[in-house]
């Protein structure tokens, strides 16, 4: 039998009936066997076909077969109901070989010219399958010349049979208190030849509960228990299953915190699998009862392991564990069914006894000693000598535990000394130097420290004085002996004060004139204000209207008197302000250098002389009555004058305090 070409020869060629294109002879049988390379098939088509037609092609025919299968038996010229001619059909081998047999019987009624056919090897597309046939590959099929290969979707691995995709479904660990797990692809059919292991692993103390939901469909067998595909559930205590078939298994209460679920499938079948919803339970903790004036959140029917609750107190109540305050409280349920900490109390906020107010007092408004939430207290300052600064003194115990003013301040109010009070009333006429009476000059301060000088009390812890009076002590403030509340210079009955710091105006130059002759002394303690110790007021912006030429000011001190000795008793003198040009002119002639009187000075005294301040009065206040406020204020500080106090045509020169208000305020606020 003639053989066609064999691979690796090129596989293509022509076949024809014997004698073609002439007629074929009777009793002919010819067989060709064509073989293509593996992964290839043979394609055959006819360019000419003319054979005797007979019923079922019994007489003359061309038979095409591939392996054991007959592909076609051909005769005639055109197909009929029972016979087939090739026409324009193309024929394909089923594998890599094709057998072609030509046979003619003993006679022909007329001459037939036979056939001519061409063949060639071509690649088989193994990925193309006929409808109804099983796909070549489970997931993806890839054709190539001479063959094909399969691959799998993510989450699968190719089985060793090179066609099936097994699910990569092991090693999943579920640690949440509830969740869902299912067979791969659920509710679509699960993969073949797979072995899946799922773990539920909860904290010790939890118990896992398994519920099969929706549908259950795992390949089964009528006689043998789950021989093909099965689901098993394993705990540290027992094994459940195997499960297969179409009935949802019952709930499984595992009484274990760890569960392993195994699902194994074989190579056949088309089943949708299973879905499990799991929950967990644990020993419940005692139901938390909120403390009075508090509430529990969140509210749950029961609280089990890891559940927690917080306590929130009503406004005006605070969380306390005994005496210790808590901003927040959260308790967590433990595995033994106990809470990890005890319930706190929601205690009414207690602001505690209010702080004492220096130079003031506090009164309980709500009730004696009541210091709890919404309680009201009233601060007030000691009458006459103190006044409350920017506050009405009413404080409420607020929810944050602090006494709070109506303006929202948590700091104490301030009792500021009332300034400028004097027992003395002034007249319009000039007196000679007179003895002061108690309460006339309660701001008067005696400064001892090498020399005798004076000053005036500001607020309750500052003294205003002249720079030249304390210049020597500027670096040794503690050397200053400061006395107040007395009229007699040598009296043992006085209020002692000590200096903490001395601030000399930066524009003052010692022994080079008296410009900027001003200083402040900070006391190391506040002094108690009373009728004999009261601060002088600083001038208001409008104060210059009370300090015009010829307006009367009062100077006081223990300085030299007309007898030439320091006064034993505090003396004072009422003197008029002198026109500035007049004063400047008075000190332009020798021995005074030009420019001795500056814009930072004011002058006071009589042209005729006799009324003046003198050595020892330095630093003392020249005061004026503000007729609008009816308070005394400091307009000048005793600074300098003629060598002979009270000399006619000469005047006392005073530091003009109104020019230094910003300087004074800055130092007092900074220190």
């Amino acid at each position: 039998t003639p053989l066609g070409p064999k691979w690796p020869e090129p596989v293509f060629g022509r076949l024809a009936s014997p004698g073609f294109p002439g007629e074929y002879a009777n009793d002919q049988e010819r067989r060709w066997t064509l073989t293509a390379p593996p992964g290839y098939r043979l394609r055959l088509y006819f360019t000419h076909f003319d054979l005797e037609l007979s019923h079922l092609c019994e007489y003359d025919f061309v038979k095409l077969s591939s392996g054991a299968k007959v592909l076609a038996t051909l005769c005639g010229q055109e197909s009929t109901d029972t016979e087939r001619a090739p026409g324009k059909d193309t024929f394909y081998s089923l594998g890599s070989s094709l057998d072609i047999t030509f046979r003619s019987d003993y006679s022909n009624e007329k001459p037939f010219t036979g056939f001519e056919a061409f063949y060639a090897a071509e690649d088989i597309d193994e990925c193309q399958v006929a409808p109804g046939e099983a796909p070549t590959c489970d997931h993806h099929c890839h054709n190539h010349l001479g063959g094909f290969y399969c691959s799998c979707r993510a989450g699968y691995v190719l089985h060793r049979n090179k066609r099936t995709c097994s699910a990569l479904c092991s090693g999943q660990v579920f640690t949440q208190r509830s969740g869902e797990l299912s067979s791969p692809e659920y509710p679509r059919p699960y993969p073949k030849l797979s072995s899946c292991t799922y773990s539920i692993s909860l904290e010790e103390g939890f118990s896992v509960i398994l519920d099969f939901v929706e549908s259950f469909d795992v390949e089964t067998h009528p006689e043998t228990l789950c021989p093909y595909d099965f689901l098993k559930i394993q705990t540290d205590r027992e094994e459940h299953g195997p499960f297969c078939g179409k009935t949802l298994p019952h709930r499984i209460e595992t009484k274990s915190n760890t569960v392993t679920i195994t699902f194994v499938t074989d190579e056949s079948g088309d089943h949708t699998g299973w879905k499990i919803h799991y929950t967990s339970t644990a020993q419940p903790c005692p139901y938390p009862m909120a403390p009075p004036n508090g509430h529990v959140s969140p509210v749950q029917a029961k609280y089990i392991l890891k559940d927690s609750f917080s306590i929130f107190c009503e406004t005006g109540y605070e969380l306390l564990q005994g005496h210790l305050p808590l901003k927040s409280f959260t308790a967590v349920c433990q595995k033994d069914g106990s809470w990890d900490r005890p319930m706190p109390a929601c205690s009414i906020v207690d602001c505690g006894p209010p702080d004492d107010l220096p130079s003031g007092r506090v009164e309980y408004i709500t009730g004696p000693g009541v210091t709890t939430y919404k309680a009201v207290i009233q601060y007030s300052c000691e009458e006459t000598f103190y006044t409350m600064k920017v506050n009405d003194g009413k404080y409420v115990c607020e929810a944050d535990g602090f006494w709070t003013s109506s303006k929202g301040e948590k700091s104490l109010p301030v009792c500021e000394p009332v300034c400028g009070l004097s027992a003395r009333t002034t007249g319009g006429r000039i007196y000679g130097g007179q003895k002061a009476k108690p309460g006339d000059f309660p701001w008067q301060v005696l400064i001892l420290g090498g020399t005798t000088a004076a000053g005036a009390l500001l607020y309750d812890n500052w003294v205003l004085t002249a720079a030249h009076a304390v210049y020597e002590q500027k670096h040794d403030a503690s050397a200053l002996d400061i006395r107040m509340g007395t009229l007699k210079r040598l009296s043992p009955h006085y209020t002692q004060a000590w200096s903490e710091a001395v601030f000399i105006h930066e524009g003052y130059t010692h022994d080079a004139g008296f410009d900027n002759d001003i200083a402040l002394i900070k006391l190391n303690n506040k002094v108690v204000i009373n009728s004999n110790i009261t601060p002088i007021c600083l001038p208001r912006k409008e104060a210059e209207s009370f300090m015009r030429t010829d307006d009367i000011g009062t100077a006081s001190g223990w300085g030299l008197t007309q007898r030439g000795f320091l006064a034993r008793n505090l003396m004072y003198v009422d003197i008029p302000i002198v026109d500035h040009q007049k004063c400047t002119a008075a000190y332009e002639k020798p021995p005074y250098p030009r420019g001795s009187v500056t814009a930072n000075m004011l002058c006071a005294g009589l042209e005729s002389g006799g009324k003046d301040s003198c050595r020892g009065d330095s630093g003392g206040a020249l005061v004026f009555l503000d007729s609008e406020t009816e308070r005394w204020f400091v307009g000048g500080i005793v600074s300098w004058g003629s060598m002979n106090c009270g000399e006619a045509g000469q005047y006392g020169v005073y530091t003009k305090v109104i020019n230094y208000i910003p300087w004074i305020e800055n130092i007092i606020s900074d220190f």
Epitope: Q321, H323, K327, S328, P342, D400, F402
Partner: antibody, heavy 115, light 107 residues
Framework: EVQLQESGPGLVKPSQTLSLTCTVS?????????WNWIRQPPGKGLEWIGY???????SYNPSLKSRVTISVDTSKNQFSLKLSSVTAADTAVYYC????????WGQGTTVTVSS | DIQMTQSPSSLSASVGDRVTITCKAS??????VAWYQQKPGKSPKALIY???YRYSGVPSRFSGSGSGTDFTLTISSLQPEDVAEYYC?????????FGQGTKLEIK
């Protein structure tokens, strides 16, 4: 981790003011709890001085109240102790601590009151 | 002030022994009691709060009980590292007060 660290002079003269600071790391003082000062005289037991709470409120041992001030500097996450008019009886190891649900102590700082 | 009276003031026990330290409050302190362990030259370390709640990291051999005025610290099996001074403390009311201490030694 929460850490507390005391700092301040180890020697204070009688009648002066003892000042100590506790620096807290790993937790904000204003977040919660009471921040305490506790002391332990040599060879003796523990004595609570007082606390400042997360909100800035203070509570003092009545036996020391007239001399004690506890304050907080939230910007530095520190709280401080001032004890005025000290005497030899105030010589002790001073601890800062947060008590109850959170319990951490500083390592302690020895303060000697002596002239 | 609430007095916290500890007993005994010192005790000696063998490794493995069960040790009990008691603390009596001069008035009701509910369960607002803590227990501290202090080793020489070290800061106190809290063991128990709210009378019976063990701090995390504290060995389970330490336990506390009691409420009102009578409280107990128990070491179920004494270990060499438990040698220390032990203090009870009440935080029920101002001032917070400590017991005078119990010195625990190994025989």
């Amino acid at each position: 981790e929460v850490q507390l660290q005391e700092s301040g002079p180890g020697l204070v003269k009688p009648s002066q003011t003892l000042s100590l600071t506790c620096t807290v790391s790993g937790y904000s003082i204003t977040s919660d709890y009471a921040w305490n000062w506790i002391r332990q005289p040599p060879g003796k037991g523990l004595e609570w001085i007082g606390y400042i709470s997360y909100s800035g409120r203070t509570s003092y041992n009545p036996s020391l109240k007239s001399r004690v001030t506890i304050s907080v500097d939230t910007s530095k996450n520190q709280f401080s102790l001032k004890l005025s008019s000290v005497t030899a009886a105030d010589t002790a190891v001073y601890y800062c601590a947060v008590l109850y649900a959170l319990d951490y102590w500083g390592q302690g700082t020895t303060v000697t009151v002596s002239s | 002030d609430i007095q916290m009276t500890q007993s005994p003031s010192s005790l000696s026990a063998s490794v493995g022994d069960r040790v009990t330290i008691t603390c009596k409050a001069s008035q009701n302190v509910d369960t607002n009691v803590a227990w501290y362990q202090q080793k020489p030259g070290k800061s106190p370390k809290a063991l128990i709060y709210s009378a019976s709640y063990r701090y995390s990291g504290v060995p389970s051999r330490f336990s506390g009980s009691g409420s009102g005025t009578d409280f107990t610290l128990t070491i179920s099996s004494l270990q060499p590292e438990d040698v220390a001074e032990y203090y009870c403390q009440q935080y029920n009311s101002n001032p917070l007060t400590f017991g005078q201490g119990t010195k625990l030694e190994i025989k």
